[in-house]
Amino acid sequence: GITNINCSGHIWVEPATIFKMGMNISIYCQAAIKNCQPRKLHFYKNGIKERFQITRINKTTARLWYKNFLEPHASMYCTAECPKHFQETLICGKDISSGYPPDIPDEVTCVIYEYSGNMTCTWNAGKLTYIDTKYVVHVKSLETEEEQQYLTSSYINISTDSLQGGKKYLVWVQAANALGMEESKQLQIHLDDIVIPSAAVISRAETINATVPKTIIYWDSQTTIEKVSCEMRYKATTNQTWNVKEFDTNFTYVQQSEFYLEPNIKYVFQVRCQETGKRYWQPWSSLFFHKTPETVPQVTSKAFQHDTWNSGLTVASISTGHLTSDNRGDIG
């Protein structure tokens, strides 16, 4: 980078090399070149010579002033016009950055995806900081008082094998960058309460010819959790509003769910599950598309036919249940 050049002087930034976006800043350049009394000192930002707001401070130093600096990153360097030299002489360079202090992390969530062997903790980091921001996840056992810390740039996967302090923990997140530090509220968790069942997957659909044609959706999960509650949502692709069916499910066999749908319409289905009575749901499964036939013949849609343009973690399961209308989209 620009900071690795051999300098014949010094460049510095006030208030600092990393500063809050929108601030007024001053960049100073001080030449220290043998037998060069600079007639002029020039500043360059990202290779382009600056023309305005340059003030000569003394024989070897000049200042460049920026009002309301909004660029996240810039490479600055300065040069001297030396008498008897045919070209400008490089003095020094520096990379500068602007951004924001971190917001208080909120919505701290820790879940254990079944079979993953990890507790995954995520949070809402707030507004973009534009500068390097690190997060320290604190995990403190409520039984042993032992605390562990994990450094990360985004979310964190913590091996469940490392959680040796029993089942109950406090989790909180510290966010820090060059401009500030903030700490989230503490989240109390019980390891048994945060398990999310193995992803539910819709495998196929068929429409059966009967007096009233019906569509059967086949779906399954590899979960070993006994009590699982699921939701399946569906709608015509032309609609905005989802219909939702709720199920209490036992995944000892492939689930079959029946729907009475309009003929000759393309529908989309998704499923998600949670351990019954617990807090966290799986994400909605991948979109599964099925077009109902115009008239009599049987139509089957298989999982490999569904569109891949909206993937995500596949999740959910269904059996029999009641129907609701859902405008809410994904449920946390």
Epitope: A32, I33, N35, C36, Q37, R56, K59, T60, P83
Partner: antibody, heavy 116, light 107 residues
Framework: QVQMVQSGAEVKRPGASVKVSCKVS????????IHWVRQAPGKGLEWMGG????????IYAQRFQGRLTMPEDTSTDTAYMELSSLTSEDTAVYYC?????????WGQGTLVTVSS | DIQMTQSPSTLSASVGDRVTITCRAS??????LAWYQQKPGKAPKLLIY???SLESGVPSRFSGSGSGTEFTLTISSLQPDDFATYYC?????????FGQGTKVEIN
């Protein structure tokens, strides 16, 4: 183009001090390194001191240390050479010059005569 | 301090002559050497800098060469206006020092 105009001739008693001025135009003193050179009657040139841009300070020739100062008034772009404890050996023409390395602009010179 | 020794001290020459003045430094000064011309009652005038670079406006009959400790100023064809005293000056190390001067006079 740099122009340097020096103050007029001075006659001083031994032990006294002299202050010679050098008014700069065309550039400001913030852009120029000023040096002072003297020349005794019928003798060669002698560098007294000047601004070193590599280290950002004024350097004085060893033989003048302690009795030579080179103040500047940037508000009027005037440089000064002040020499104290004068003796007859300090009788010379004193030149201000710029720009550092080498000296490509010179004042017209100021004759300082030290006589009892 | 670095000593600068010029030779000769005085040089008699005629118009049209090729004139060479030498300057020796007591230690290496790389190419940080200047040559000046001075006429009676006048301030010195820069001719050559960095040992061999001709100052703007100086006639091309003046040239400089050398590096380290040995330097020369050459006037290829002496003109009437060239009769003056010439000084070398090192500006490698403070204190800067001048040679004692070479007076070029009419033969």
């Amino acid at each position: 183009q740099v122009q340097m105009v020096q103050s007029g001739a001075e006659v001083k008693r031994p032990g006294a001090s002299v202050k010679v001025s050098c008014k700069v135009s065309g550039y400001t003193l913030n852009e120029l390194g000023i040096h002072w050179v003297r020349q005794a009657p019928g003798k060669g040139l002698e560098w007294m001191g000047g601004f070193d841009p590599e280290h950002g300070k004024i350097i004085y020739a060893q033989r003048f240390q302690g009795r030579l100062t080179m103040p500047e008034d940037t508000s009027t772009d005037t440089a000064y050479m002040e020499l104290s404890s004068l003796t007859s050996e300090d009788t010379a023409v004193y030149y201000c010059a710029t720009v550092a390395a080498p000296l490509d602009y010179w004042g017209q010179g100021t004759l300082v005569t030290v006589s009892s | 301090d670095i000593q600068m020794t010029q030779s000769p001290s005085t040089l008699s020459a005629s118009v049209g002559d090729r004139v060479t003045i030498t300057c020796r430094a007591s230690q290496s000064i790389s190419s940080w050497l200047a040559w000046y011309q001075q006429k009676p009652g006048k301030a010195p005038k820069l001719l050559i800098y960095k040992a061999s670079s001709l100052e703007s406006g100086v006639p091309s009959r003046f040239s400089g060469s050398g590096s380290g400790t040995e330097f020369t100023l050459t006037i290829s064809s002496l003109q009437p206006d060239d009769f003056a005293t010439y000084y070398c000056q090192q500006y490698d190390i403070y204190s800067w020092t001048f040679g004692q001067g070479t007076k070029v006079e009419i033969n």
